[in-house]
C-alpha cells in the first residue's frame, strides 16, 4: 500500500549489524509523486566499490547509488548525510553484509517522503503537445484558442473534421489556408454524393504545399484520398505530386490530412465535382451496341444486339438482344449476359433415314441427312445438307427448316428375276425378285405393296374378308416361314366403287373395276425383301402395247399343285383382248357370252403355257418403266381368266391411278405426312 513517508533502518540498528545478511525494502508512494530518500546515519564497512558491505538504491532498472563507509552531515542545521531525489513513485533499497567485519559497524538510518514532481519540466519527453500545467500529484495539458484537447488528454489539434460535403461541386482547403496549417492535427473531410456519381478531384500544383517527406520517403504531413478500397496518396511536398485530376470511381470520398508537431506550411486547396459514373465501353464479342457512344455514364441504357448466329441464353430462353444500364456503381447491368453462338441442338431424327452425330451443333455447323439407301430416297429434295442458321434452326437451302422425307424407292428389286418356267409354266422365284409381293392367307391370294401404308390388290380378294391377314418378305409361305416374315395388319379396306358386290360371288361374270386398296395400321419397313412397286404414270408412255412383257408372281396354282409354297413367277406378253375372249371358259358358271370384257382389263399370256391362276389374284403384273428401265410399275393386277395356262385378265391399273391417289390422300395420317 503506497505511503507518503517512512523510515528504513539497518538490521539491529543502532547496534552493530550482523554478518552475512541481505535485506531489501520496496518503497512506494502514490502515483504522481516522486520520492525523496535521505540518510541521517551511515556506518558501513568501507570497501572499494562497496564490494563487502553496502546499501544499494535502485529505481526501476537503474542503480541510483551504492553507499558504504561513514558519513557525517556537512550542514550543522541538517542531520542528512546522503540524499536521493527520484521522479518515480517506486524505489528499492537493498542492504548487504559479507561474512566478516573487522570492526563493529552500526549500519544506517534513512527516511523517505513523497514529493511532488513537475511532469512538465522533469522529463525529457514533454507530456503535452502545447501547454503543460503542473499540480501537486499530477499535471494537465491545455491548448491555445481554436485548438481542442484530444481524447489522449495530451495532444491538441484543430477541430477540422466532421465536415460532410454533399453538393455536386465544391471547394475544400486545409485549415487557415493559405496561412500555415495547424500542427499535430488530423483533419477528415467526407464527400458523399448521390449514388451514380463519382467524385472527381482537381488540384493545381501551386495550391499544394505540405511538409516534405523524410529521407526514407515517408510523408511527415500528408494528404490522403480514400474511395472505398482505393487509396490515392499519401501526398506531401511543395507542389502537388499526384494527378491533377483524380477520378475516384466512387460517390464517397474521404480526405484525410495528417500533420505532426513541426514544419507547418501553407497547406492545400482543391476543387471537386460529381461526374455521372462512367461505365466502360466493354468489348462484348459478337454483338453491336445501340446507341454507339465514345463514353457511357450513369443511367445510360444500351441495347446489345447479337450478330446473326449468336444469341443470349438466359435460363432456357434464347433472345437476340438485351438491354444494359450503366449503374450507379460504374458497372453495367446484365453484364453476365453474353452473345453465344446459336446452338441448333441435336438434329431431329427422321424416319427411314439418319443424320451423322454432328461434331458441333453451333451456328454455322453443317449436318447431312441421308436416307436408308437403296430402299429409301429423299423425296423433297434439298440434298440433305442443313446448316445451323442464325435463328437456331437447322436449315436447308431448298427446304428451309422442313426436314427431309425419306420415302421408299419403288419398283427396284434387289435381285432381277431370271425368268424360266412356272406359276403355270413359270419358275421358282425369290422374294428379292418381287419385294412388293404380298401374301394373303384367306383367301389364298396376292397383292402389291405400293408404299409404306398401302397394299393394292384385286377387289374380289378382299370382298369377302375386310380384315385380311397379309405377309411380306418371305419367299415361302409355310406357317414356319410366315412366322419369321412381316405380318401386315389392315386398318381399312377400300374397294373401288365401280366393283359390283354380289350375293353369290362364285357366279361372277363381271370383273370390271377389280381393284381395291388396303390401308395398313403401321408403316412397313423397307429392305431387300420388302419394297413397293411403282404406280403407272398417267402419260401415254404407260399405255401398254401388244407384245409388251410383264412379270407376274404368286403362290397360286401350278401345273402340279393347287397352291405353291415357294414363290413362282413368269414373264408374259400383253395380248389383244380378243385373245382372252376366244378362250373357252374352263368351268363356266354362266353362259360364255355373259363374261364381261372392258377397256379396264389387260389380256396377257398365251406363250409356253405361262399364266396366272387361282391363288395368284391381286398380284402385280409388273412392267418395266418406259422412262426408267431400272424400275417396274404395276401395270395390272391378277384378276380372272377363262382357263389357267392360256390367257389371263388383269385389271388395268393406269385407269385407276386417280382413284388410288385420291383414296390414299383422303385416308392418310399425319404420321405419314
Amino acid at each position: 500500500e503506497p505511503t507518503m513517508y517512512g523510515e528504513i533502518l539497518s538490521p539491529n540498528y543502532p547496534q552493530a549489524y550482523p554478518s552475512e545478511v541481505e535485506k531489501s525494502w520496496d518503497i512506494e508512494v502514490p502515483e504522481g509523486y516522486g520520492i525523496h530518500l535521505y540518510f541521517t546515519h551511515l556506518d558501513i564497512e568501507l570497501s572499494e566499490n562497496c564490494a563487502y558491505d553496502s546499501v544499494q538504491i535502485i529505481s526501476g532498472d537503474t542503480e541510483e547509488g551504492r553507499l558504504c563507509g561513514q558519513r557525517s552531515s556537512n550542514n550543522p542545521h541538517s542531520p542528512i548525510v546522503e540524499e536521493f531525489q527520484v521522479p518515480y513513485n517506486k524505489l528499492q533499497v537493498i542492504f548487504k553484509s559479507d561474512f566478516s567485519n573487522e570492526e563493529r559497524f552500526t549500519g544506517f538510518a534513512a527516511y523517505y517522503v513523497a514529493t511532488d514532481i513537475n511532469e512538465c519540466t522533469d522529463f525529457v519527453d514533454v507530456p503535452c503537445s502545447h501547454f503543460c500545467n503542473n499540480f501537486i500529484g499530477g499535471y494537465f495539458c491545455s491548448c491555445p484558442p481554436e485548438y481542442f484537447l484530444h481524447d489522449d488528454m495530451k495532444n491538441c489539434g484543430v477541430n477540422c473534421s466532421g465536415d460532410v460535403f454533399t453538393a455536386l461541386i465544391g471547394e475544400i482547403a486545409s485549415p487557415n489556408y493559405p496561412k500555415p496549417y495547424p500542427e499535430n492535427s488530423r483533419c477528415e473531410y467526407q464527400i458523399r454524393l448521390e449514388k451514380g456519381f463519382q467524385v472527381v478531384v482537381t488540384l493545381r500544383r501551386e495550391d499544394f504545399d505540405v511538409e516534405a517527406a523524410d529521407s526514407a520517403g515517408n510523408c511527415l504531413d500528408s494528404l490522403v484520398f480514400v474511395a472505398g478500397d482505393r487509396q490515392f496518396g499519401p501526398y506531401c511536398g511543395h507542389g502537388f505530386p499526384g494527378p491533377l485530376n483524380i477520378e475516384t470511381k466512387s460517390n464517397a470520398l474521404d480526405i484525410i490530412f495528417q500533420t505532426d508537431l513541426t514544419g507547418q506550411k501553407k497547406g492545400w486547396k482543391l476543387r471537386y465535382h460529381g461526374d455521372p459514373m462512367p461505365c466502360p465501353k466493354e468489348d462484348t464479342p459478337n454483338s453491336v451496341w445501340e446507341p454507339a457512344k465514345a463514353k457511357y455514364v450513369f443511367r445510360d441504357v444500351v441495347q446489345i444486339t447479337c450478330l446473326d448466329g449468336f444469341e443470349v441464353v438466359e435460363g432456357r430462353v434464347g433472345a437476340t438482344s438485351f438491354y444494359s444500364t450503366c449503374q450507379s456503381n460504374g458497372k453495367w447491368s446484365n453484364s453476365k449476359l453474353k452473345c453465344q453462338p446459336v446452338d441448333c441442338g441435336i438434329p431431329e431424327s427422321i424416319e427411314n433415314g439418319k443424320v451423322e452425330d454432328p461434331e458441333s451443333t453451333l451456328f454455322g455447323s453443317v449436318i447431312r441427312y441421308t436416307c436408308e439407301e437403296p430402299y429409301y430416297y429423299m423425296e423433297n429434295g434439298g440434298g440433305g445438307e442443313y446448316h445451323c442458321a442464325g435463328n437456331g434452326s437447322w436449315v436447308n437451302e431448298v427446304l428451309g427448316p422442313e426436314l427431309p422425307k425419306c420415302v421408299p424407292v419403288c419398283g427396284v428389286p434387289r435381285e432381277p428375276f431370271e425368268e424360266k418356267q412356272r406359276i403355270i409354266g413359270g419358275s421358282d422365284a425369290d422374294i428379292k425378285n418381287f419385294p412388293w409381293q404380298v401374301f394373303f392367307d384367306n383367301p389364298w391370294a396376292g397383292g402389291a405393296l405400293i408404299n409404306e401404308y398401302w397394299v393394292l390388290t384385286a377387289a374380289h380378294v378382299v370382298e369377302g374378308n375386310r380384315e385380311p391377314t397379309m405377309y411380306v418378305g418371305s419367299t415361302s409361305v409355310q406357317t414356319s416361314r410366315l412366322a419369321k416374315s412381316k405380318m401386315l395388319t389392315p386398318e381399312h379396306v377400300f374397294i373401288h366403287p365401280g366393283w359390283k358386290l354380289l350375293e353369290v360371288p362364285e357366279g361372277r361374270t363381271n370383273f370390271d373395276n377389280d381393284i381395291a386398296l388396303v390401308r395398313l395400321k403401321d408403316p412397313v419397313k423397307m429392305g431387300p425383301t420388302v419394297s413397293p412397286i411403282c404406280l403407272p404414270g398417267t402419260s401415254s408412255d404407260y399405255n401398254l402395247m401388244d407384245g409388251d412383257l410383264g412379270l407376274i408372281s404368286g403362290w397360286g396354282r401350278t401345273e402340279k399343285r393347287d397352291r405353291a409354297v415357294r414363290l413362282k413367277a413368269a414373264r408374259l406378253p400383253v395380248a389383244p383382248l380378243r385373245k382372252c375372249k376366244e378362250v373357252k371358259v374352263e368351268k363356266p358358271t354362266a353362259d360364255a357370252e355373259a363374261y364381261v370384257f372392258t377397256p379396264n382389263m389387260i389380256c396377257a399370256g398365251g406363250e409356253k403355257g405361262m399364266d396366272s391362276c387361282k391363288g395368284d389374284s391381286g398380284g402385280a403384273f409388273a412392267v418395266q418403266d418406259p422412262n426408267d428401265k431400272t424400275k417396274f410399275y404395276a401395270a395390272g393386277l391378277v384378276s380372272w381368266g377363262p382357263q389357267c395356262g392360256t390367257y389371263g385378265l388383269y385389271t388395268r391399273v393406269k385407269n385407276y391411278v386417280d382413284w388410288i391417289m385420291k383414296t390414299m390422300q383422303e385416308n392418310s395420317t399425319p404420321r405419314e405426312d
Epitope: 431370271e418 418356267q421 419358275s427 421358282d428 406357317t479 414356319s480 402340279k560 409354297v565 415357294r566
Partner: antibody, heavy 118, light 107 residues
Amino acid sequence: QVQLVESGGGLVKPGGSLRLSCAASGFTFSDYYMSWIRQAPGKGLEWVSYISRSGSTKYYADSVKGRFTISRDNAKNSLYLQMNSLRAEDTAVYYCARDESDYALDFWGQGTLVTVSS
Amino acid sequence: DIQMTQSPSSLSASVGDRVTITCQASQDISNYLNWYQQKPGKAPKLLIYDASNLETGVPSRFSGSGSGTDFTFTISSLQPEDIATYYCQQYEDLIPTFGGGTKVEIK
C-alpha cells in the same frame, strides 16, 4: 436326261476340311433350288443345306451351321459344299439333289462318301 | 425343329399285299409332306409330293394321304421291285427333315 454327279469325298481327319462338288447337266441349272442331303452309314436321311436359284438365300441344318457353306456357280452348272471343322459324326454319304419345286427333291446324285476319322 | 416319326421301322409283306406306312409330325405341317423310296445302294427317289400328289412316272399303286400331323403312305399291291426303305419328309420347317425310314421286305 437330268444328271447330278458328286465328287470331292474321301477320308479326312477330325478338324479337317473338304469341298464337295456337284456337276449338273440335262436341265437349266439356274432354274432350280439345289440341296445337299447326307446319310450316315446304316442310318436315315438328313437334310444338310439348300440354296436358292440365284444363291442369295441359303439355309443350314443346326448340326452344320457355322461349319459348312453351300454355294453355286450357275455359269458352271455346279453346286458346292465347303465343309470345315469336320467331326466324326459328319461321316456320311453326301447327296446333291434338285428341288423341283416346293422342297420336293425330284433328282438325286449317286452320292459321295465322306469319312472323318483319325 | 419338327420331328417326323415313321412306323413301323420295318415290315415284311407278301407280293400283292397292301402295305401301309404312317408318319406323324410333332406339329401341324398342313400337307407339306413328301414320300421317297430308297433302294439299297441307290439314291432316294421322289414318289409323292404335297402328301397326296403322285410324282410323274410313279406307278399308281403308290398313294399318300393325310393332313396336319398324321400321314399315310400306301402300296396297294406290293411288287418285288418295291423292296426298299421309304422315307417321309416335311417341308413346313425352315430346314426340311426326314422320318427315320421304314424298311419294306418281301416275305
